[in-house]
Interface confidence: low
């Protein structure tokens, strides 16, 4: 799921202090960020042995996942790193800190610490300001749920090094203009607002200038008030697959839900030659079923060594207290020659999805 190199968001760390126990901190990071979660001991006392947990499973340290008693660092984050993270006391399993982490494509809306976009010596004698990373500034509309941390960035250069200032709805924007203040990171060309609220909605403009000129960029921030909704599903492509006998197949389904969803993978089946029951409800068999703690879950159904009877319609179903959402997936299984012919036909049609 990584972006192409030229588009990739280069790594940057975003350290976030832990919330009060029992509260859930909602955090959004960009793909490629270093996700850094900090959980100081409650009341400043001794921490004792802790364990970091993601979506109910203990995290195993690796080259990419660095686990410490008070801090978790996930390097080069991708969509799969989205989920519910908690730091727990090892003995009691008491949750000390709880974070909901979502990793999206750029731009990141976490904070920025690493100074990676500091003003650089451009090698130009004199020059008006210019954007150094315009590809990072494509997303003009940022819509985030209330309580998230938002960051707007305008990485620029020029000689002499330009200054940056920020406007909100066309007027000078300063920390005292919002509860919770703002962080202006001039060396990272960024404006950071923590725990956004609906009154933070508006147009934010960075003005970058030196004596040779001025450039500006406007972003629109929409803060989504959390109104409960049914789960939202996105089917990972390809939703319909053709597989060769004996091969492995994987279906992807992305589930978004503020309320804890009950997620199921189902398969349509026939009972006594009928696909539906007397009341018209389709017959299904439950392949996987679990409650997700995550606001955004990337769920997969893996079918190994498929046979002809694995063919048919599969369902990804998510239910929360508001409603139900479903996505259908189709699998057709063929012997080697039939599958090759189908792929050739698909190739001629200009679209190949190898099973």
């Amino acid at each position: 799921e990584s972006l192409g190199t030229e588009q990739r968001v280069v790594g940057r760390a975003a350290e976030v202090p832990g919330p009060e126990p029992g509260q859930q901190e909602q955090l959004v990071f960009g793909s490629g960020d270093a996700v850094e979660l900090s959980c100081p001991p409650p009341g400043g006392g001794p921490m004792g042995p802790t364990v970091w947990v993601k979506d109910g499973t203990g995290l195993v340290p690796s080259e990419r996942v660095l686990v410490g008693p008070q801090r978790l660092q996930v390097l080069n984050a991708s969509h799969e790193d989205s989920g519910a993270y908690s730091c727990r006391q090892r003995l009691t399993q008491r949750v000390l800190c709880h974070f909901s982490v979502r990793v999206t494509d750029a731009p990141s809306s976490g904070d920025d610490e690493d100074g990676e976009d500091e003003a650089e010596d451009t090698g130009v004698d004199t020059g008006a300001p210019y954007w150094t990373r315009p590809e990072r500034m494509d997303k003009k509309l940022l819509a985030v749920p209330a309580a998230n941390t938002v960051r707007f960035r305008c990485p620029a250069a020029g000689n002499p090094t330009p200054s940056i200032s920020w406007l909100k709805n066309g007027r000078e924007f300063r920390g005292e203009h919002r509860i919770g203040g703002i962080k202006l990171r001039h060396q990272q060309w960024s404006l950071v607002m923590e725990s956004v609220v609906p009154s933070d909605r508006g147009n934010y403009t960075c003005v970058v200038e030196n004596k040779f000129g001025s450039i500006r960029q406007t972003y629109t921030l929409d803060v989504l008030e959390r109104s409960p909704h049914r789960p939202i599903l996105q089917a990972g492509l390809p939703a319909n697959q053709t597989a060769v006998l004996g091969s492995d197949v994987e279906f992807h389904c992305k589930v978004y839900s503020d309320a804890q969803p009950h997620i199921q993978w189902l398969k349509h089946v026939e009972v006594n030659g009928s696909k539906v029951g007397p009341d018209g409800t389709p017959y299904v068999t439950v392949l996987k079923s679990w409650i997700s703690e995550s606001v955004e879950a990337d769920v997969r159904l893996r079918l190994a060594n498929v046979s002809e009877r694995d063919g048919g319609e599969y369902l990804c179903r998510a239910t929360n207290f508001i409603g139900v959402a479903e996505k259908a997936f189709w699998l057709s299984v063929h012997g080697p020659r039939a599958a090759e012919e189908e792929l050739v036909e698909a190739d001629e049609a200009g679209s190949v999805y190898a099973g």
Partner: antibody, heavy 122, light 108 residues
């Protein structure tokens, strides 16, 4: 604040078409759906269909399939409902309602337009 | 389609009364039920969602309960502005979204 403002009264002849508009303000239009609900004089509420502003996906009530088309214009934050081949039993007040879910319909309708009376009469 | 049946169809009550309206689904809809209030010439207004959650800005005298197939809307102490028509709506199985036929609450 969130508002849905609908177009005005329409009088149509049987067989004609009507297009009702619903202009949204006070929220990010594309992150929600719009459902259309109608109410014949002295009758209850009847759901007509839904459109996702996010991706243009639609779901229509079976009895209206083929006669109704729902569209949106994100540049003006406006939703439209067109009903063709009008009959006298299409005389009703037509409401648009914000559907709080932008991928599938079925969310409680938290904001409604004021209604548009459509009279079909020869 | 899931059918929603409200009872009674109409009801007379006085200010201060406790009033209960019931809604029955033709099959289980878990807690995916919403209640609306509609006054003559006006659009419906959401009162209760998910069977028992009070919509923001709605007075606390309104409450909802039930799950599965049987649901109730209760107004603990009727106020003059509560005389209206009330509709239940299921959001479990869509399309179609289906409403009850309505309960008209009149002044006795």
């Amino acid at each position: 604040q969130v508002q849905l403002v609908q177009s005005g009264v329409e009088v149509k002849k049987p067989g004609a078409s009507v297009k009702v508009s619903c202009k949204a303000s006070g929220y990010t239009f594309k992150f929600y759906g719009i459902s259309w609900v109608r109410q014949a004089p002295g009758q209850g509420l009847e759901w007509m269909g839904w459109i996702s502003v996010y991706n243009g996906k639609t779901k229509y009530a079976q009895k209206l399939q083929g006669r109704v088309t729902m569209t949106t214009d994100t540049s003006t934050s406006t939703a439209y409902m067109e009903l063709r081949s009008l009959r006298s039993d299409d005389t009703a007040v037509y409401f648009c309602a914000r559907d709080g879910d932008y991928e599938s319909s079925g969310y409680p309708f938290d904001y409604w337009g004021q209604g548009t009376l459509v009279t079909v009469s020869s | 389609d899931i059918q929603m049946t409200q009872s009674p169809s109409s009801l007379s009550a006085s200010v201060g009364d406790r009033v209960t309206i019931t809604c029955r689904a033709s099959q289980s809809i878990s807690s995916y039920l919403n209640w609306y209030q509609q006054k003559p010439g006006k659009a419906p207004k959401l009162l209760i969602y998910a069977a028992s959650s009070l919509q923001s800005g709605v007075p606390s005298r309104f409450s909802g309960s039930g799950s599965g197939t049987d649901f109730t809307l209760t107004i603990s102490s009727l106020q003059p502005e509560d005389f209206a028509t009330y509709y239940c709506q299921q959001s479990y199985s869509t399309p179609p979204i289906t409403f009850g036929q309505g309960t008209r609450l009149e002044i006795k």
